[in-house]
């Protein structure tokens, strides 16, 4: 025969632990019912009567199955320069993150204890790894045939472009300048003399340098934070 | 409310080391980061570091890396700055201060520790 | 390290004049720039955080605007308890760094 169900409150066996969702009563020395989450005990069990629960209070909270006399306070409403990432409910406690361009330096249970700015790569190196709300950002030099002409938390090193006469060759801070192609090469019928890169790679916004421009020695300096993040030595 | 309340003044001889506290109250003391902030006589202020008495982080100016050691003594809700190897130069006002939010920005301060290094 | 120049060192006004403190970041700071309002022998006062929102308690008559290198404080109409010196701290990164103060003095 199969084992009856007990129905709470009950005794439980000697050396037994009460079932899932459930609690020991010491008062009433019974397996009683636990509330659920957004929910709190309004009345304890007694050796006749199961739990009582109740739902939390407006900016009150329960996250877990449970039996305390009151949900618990949501935290106080996010300031002015920080991003409500999670509402207050019944069931869970606001949570507060940095405003944007910023991440979680120093967290704490629900938040953070202490944000800076995401490491902004320098000219020369490209982000490798984007920043997240708890991570800062990581930065690499760009590898040769790429290129990041920007101060930025989220560039990446790009591809040169594509020459058929190269007038300026690429560096880790500068994309490669093309020339017009060369009159004495011969050309298809109806080519254009343009001078645009070969390869069909979108085009991005900046402006080319001019010829004139020297080559930038950026990508060789060190690739440390601008500006340091939280608990770095700086350049 | 909050309150950072400082020890009294200081007179050392160079070279000696200094240890000044900050006792807190108002607040839980493991939830706040406590700054270390100093202003010489007739001049701008100086960010000496912070110190989280929570985890023992701590992110010191490198100015003062080789010199500075801030620690706590949680069972009485305060922190420490010990600065060593002093010079006539240290002689200054050292104020605790800490932030609300996660941004640094000090709403709330000690009343500040005269400090003076003279031989 | 980011420097924080802060001009003028000194300025004599009147009650009831209107006073402006400008601060100039080495480098981009967002809009991470606080002002303290600090009288002699006393610990700095938070003024204004976020380059322009006020601190708990703090009179309209104190605003703050700027972004990226360039902050100002602006005091409306001056009154008998602004005379104090005024600092700008960045609140961007490590190290936080102050300018050198504005010292505002009775004409």
């Known amino acids: 025969l199969p084992a009856q169900v007990a129905f709470t409150p009950y005794a439980p066996e000697p050396g037994s632990t009460c079932r899932l969702r459930e609690y020991y009563d010491q008062t009433a020395q019974m397996c009683c019912s636990k509330c659920s989450p957004g929910q709190h005990a309004k009345v304890f069990c007694t050796k006749t009567s199961d739990t009582v629960c109740d739902s939390c209070e407006d900016s009150t909270y329960t996250q877990l199955w449970n039996w305390v006399p009151e949900c618990l306070s949501c935290g106080s409403r996010c300031s002015s320069d920080q991003v409500e990432t999670q509402a207050c409910t019944r069931e869970q406690n606001r949570i507060c993150t940095c405003r944007p361009g910023w991440y979680c330096a120093l967290s704490k249970q629900e938040g953070c204890r202490l944000c800076a700015p995401l490491r902004k790569c320098r000219p020369g190196f490209g982000v490798a790894r984007p920043g997240t709300e708890t991570s800062d950002v990581v930065c690499k030099p760009c590898a040769p045939g790429t290129f990041s002409n920007t101060t930025s938390s989220t560039d990446i090193c790009r591809p040169h472009q594509i020459c058929n006469v190269v007038a300026i060759p690429g560096n880790a801070s500068m994309d490669a300048v093309c020339t017009s192609t060369s009159p004495t090469r011969s050309m298809a019928p109806g080519a254009v003399h343009l001078p645009q890169p070969v390869s069909t790679r979108s085009q991005h916004t900046q402006p080319t340098p001019e010829p004139s421009t020297a080559p930038s020695t950026s990508f060789l300096l060190p690739m440390g934070p601008s500006p340091p993040a939280e608990g770095s030595t700086g350049d | 409310q909050v309150q950072l309340v400082q020890s009294g003044a200081e007179v050392k001889k160079p070279g000696a080391s200094v240890k000044v506290s900050c006792k807190a109250s108002g607040y839980t003391f493991t939830e706040s980061i406590i700054h270390w902030v100093r202003q010489a006589t007739g001049q701008g202020l100086e960010w000496m570091g912070w110190f989280y008495p929570g985890s023992d982080n701590i992110n010191y100016n490198e100015k003062f890396k080789d010199r500075v050691t801030m620690t706590r003594n949680t069972s009485i809700s305060t922190a420490y700055m010990e600065l060593s190897s002093l010079r006539s130069e240290d002689t200054a006002v050292y104020y605790c201060?800490?932030?609300?939010?996660?941004?640094?920005?000090?709403?709330?301060w000690g009343q500040g520790t005269t400090v003076t290094v003279s031989s | 390290d980011i420097q924080m120049t802060q001009s003028p060192s000194s300025l004599s006004a009147s009650v009831g004049d209107r006073v402006t403190i400008t601060c100039k970041a080495s480098q981009d700071v967002s809009t991470a720039v606080a002002w303290y309002q600090q009288k002699p022998g006393k610990a700095p006062k938070l003024l204004i955080y976020?380059?322009?929102t006020r601190h708990t308690g703090v009179p309209s008559r104190f605003s703050g605007s700027g972004s990226g290198t360039d902050f100002t404080l602006t005091i409306s109409s001056l009154q008998p308890e602004d005379f104090a010196t005024y600092y700008c701290?960045?609140?961007?990164?490590?190290?936080?760094?102050f300018g050198q103060g504005t010292k505002l003095e009775i004409k």
């Open positions: 976020w380059t322009s």
């Open positions: 201060a800490r932030h609300e939010g996660p941004y640094v920005y000090f709403d709330y």
């Open positions: 701290q960045h609140h961007y990164s490590t190290p936080y760094t």
